[in-house]
């Protein structure tokens, strides 16, 4: 099984124990590590952070001790913006320039492939996204030669039904991608006005349309029905939780909220907590399991957080094995307890390790 793990370059800027550099990563934990994100400037793939080249080197030296590890560079992301991707993909010359710039950049910096993180193609971009993938793969095939393995090509795709329908020609893009990471998280957010788990495995008992689509099981099944081969589908598992501020004394699933949860001490983003911050939060909190959805949530005061723990990730891994998927994807290594100092287990990357162990179990 593949265990595809994202690392985010901006995690270096978190304070104190939250700061994560690629040399803190475990070279034997994942089969693939994806560095997020690269930029595109003047139609050429480019660095984003001032010290990306140094960080690329840090990441890729992990392969010196584990030659089986593959590293990919992810281009795009939320801050890149869909419009910029759209302009490049829809123009034949811009697209060719971008595609031609990728292999030299990846080779120079020691990456084994490219991950496309166009979040998200619009309805008009659907065909252009397919063309971009098809032409990128053709370039990778042509560029490969003896002593120079073919570069890998993957894409991170939304798990939302509406986005899947408007953005992706699943059957066509699947032909050209080496694997597809389906982002089976962020199904529920503060915009809903109520509490809810952002990455449930199954549909909730109360879920009516459109909520009946907002779960991992539906998204995976839908992708498979649309023609994604199970052998290329990698299922996303988050090492972060989504939090809410409760608006009343109700604390269950579906309780009213006044907005996102308070920012974490290190991640500093309202409504999001890294797993290592959740471990802190759990001291003195009340933990519940959403039985049908097979995921936990915790409450403390007026704060509510839905997250994944070692038990829920094992359930998810069992599920993806039952569906004969290619493996699991983790967003993100730097949100797990990468130092092993927060979650009281004396174990670095406890969630990702639980996923790895479950994948290896017979």
């Amino acid at each position: 099984y593949k265990l595809v793990c994202y690392y985010t370059s901006w995690s270096q800027y978190r304070e104190g124990d939250g700061s994560c550099f690629p040399d803190a990563l475990d070279r034997f934990l994942c089969t693939h590590i994806i560095y997020s994100f690269a930029n595109i400037s003047n139609d050429h793939i480019d660095t984003w952070e001032w010290n990306d080249v140094t960080l690329y080197g840090m990441l890729n030296t992990l392969k010196n001790r584990n030659p089986n590890l593959k590293t990919l560079l992810s281009v795009g992301g939320w801050n890149f913006g869909s419009q910029r991707f759209s302009k490049i993909a829809s123009n034949t010359q811009s697209r060719r320039t971008f595609i031609k710039s990728v292999p030299p950049f990846l080779r120079t910096h020691g990456f084994d492939g490219l991950d496309l993180a166009w979040l998200y193609p619009g309805r008009r971009d659907k065909q252009h996204f397919t063309t971009l993938i098809k032409e990128m793969k053709a370039e990778f095939i042509k560029e490969a030669q003896p002593g120079k393995k073919q570069l890998l090509l993957s894409a991170a795709l939304s798990a939302g039904k509406v986005t899947i329908d408007s953005s992706y020609d699943i059957a066509k893009i699947s032909q050209h991608l080496d694997f597809i990471s389906i982002m089976t998280y962020d199904f529920h957010g503060a915009w809903r006005g109520t509490t809810g788990h952002h990455s449930p495995l199954f549909r909730g008992q109360e879920d009516a349309s459109p909520d009946r689509f907002s779960n991992t099981d539906y998204a995976v099944g839908y992708m498979l029905r649309l023609g994604a081969p199970a052998s290329k589908l990698v299922m996303g598992i988050p090492t972060f939780g989504r939090s809410f501020t409760l608006a009343s004394s109700e604390t269950g699933v579906g309780a009213p909220i006044s907005g996102p949860g308070i920012p974490g001490r290190f991640t500093k983003e309202a409504g999001t907590l890294a797993y290592y911050e959740i471990c802190d939060f759990l001291r003195g909190a009340t933990v519940h399991r959403i039985l049908g959805q097979q995921v936990p949530y915790a409450t403390k005061g007026n704060q509510w957080v839905g997250y994944d723990d070692q038990e829920s990730v094992k359930s998810k891994v069992q599920y993806l094995k039952d569906r004969q998927l290619a493996g699991a994807m983790v967003w993100a290594l730097d949100l797990d307890d990468f130092q092993g100092s927060f979650c009281g287990q004396d174990l670095r990357f406890p969630l990702t390790n639980a996923i790895k162990d479950a994948l290896a179990a017979t």
């Epitope: 890729n60 950049f105 120079t108 003896p146 002593g147």
Partner: antibody, heavy 118, light 111 residues
Framework: EVQLVESGGGLVQPGGSLRLSCAAS????????MTWVRQTPGKGLQWVST????????FYADSVKGRFTISRDNSKNMVYLHMNSLRAEDTAIYYC???????????WGQGTLVTVSS | NFMLTQPHSVSESPGKTVTISCTRS????????VQWYQQRPDSAPTTVIY?????PSGVPDRFSGAIDSSANSASLTISGLQTEDEADYYC?????????FGTGTKVTVLG
């Protein structure tokens, strides 16, 4: 500035052995495949062997398979060509070349002459 | 293995244009990139064209590459021929298991 310097050439009898070395500088060595190409005096170029950046995949021309071994030491920025069971037809200038990020070899050494003769 | 066949020699006066062909014996010329190397006497080869049509920095735009899929051949064109262009030129391509050089073409600048 990328520099490749070959050494180890010389006169050897048929059936003998030789080890060529290529010292690389000015590049992130483990990121690039490295190649040996030879040229018989007055004749054309012939690919001999290529090794991937991490050294896990060697490739050989049919004419040298089983006799030549390519290897690399990424900690020393060195690539080697171990040549056994040498034949008269192996006489050539041997060039070390860096695999480009594109499909050509973008830097070459000045070559080292190997003469196989009794 | 496939072969790449080039004309043995071509000659032309300074300022004129020469085109060297490189025909692939089996497999499609378009399925793998073609490179062109220039080798002056007593020197190592240098790349003048890579990936069919691309020129490395420092190579004058008098050098251009092309692919003719119907003839299953690649070509190198040198326009505005200069005395320093006198050299041997080799095309090169590859498949999944080996690299192949062309037979080589000697370009002579007359006069």
């Amino acid at each position: 500035e990328v520099q490749l310097v070959e050494s180890g050439g010389g006169l050897v009898q048929p059936g003998g052995s030789l080890r060529l070395s290529c010292a690389a500088s000015g590049l992130t060595f483990p990121n690039f495949a490295m190649t040996w190409v030879r040229q018989t005096p007055g004749k054309g170029l012939q690919w001999v062997s290529t090794i991937s950046g991490r050294g896990d995949e060697p490739f050989y021309a049919d004419s040298v398979k089983g006799r030549f071994t390519i290897s690399r030491d990424n900690s020393k920025n060195m690539v080697y060509l171990h040549m056994n069971s040498l034949r008269a037809e192996d006489t050539a200038i041997y060039y070390c070349a860096k695999g480009g990020h594109f499909s050509s070899w973008d830097y070459w050494g000045q070559g080292t002459l190997v003469t196989v003769s009794s | 293995n496939f072969m790449l066949t080039q004309p043995h020699s071509v000659s032309e006066s300074p300022g004129k244009t020469v085109t060297i062909s490189c025909t692939r014996s089996s497999g499609s010329i378009a399925s793998n990139y073609v490179q062109w190397y220039q080798q002056r006497p007593d020197s190592a080869p240098t790349t003048v064209i890579y990936e069919d049509i691309e020129r490395p920095s420092g190579v004058p735009d008098r050098f251009s590459g092309a692919i003719d899929s119907s003839a299953n051949s690649a070509s190198l064109t040198i326009s505005g021929l200069q005395t320093e262009d006198e050299a041997d030129y080799y095309c090169q391509s590859y498949d999944s298991s080996s690299y192949v050089f062309g037979t080589g073409t000697k370009v002579t600048v007359l006069g």
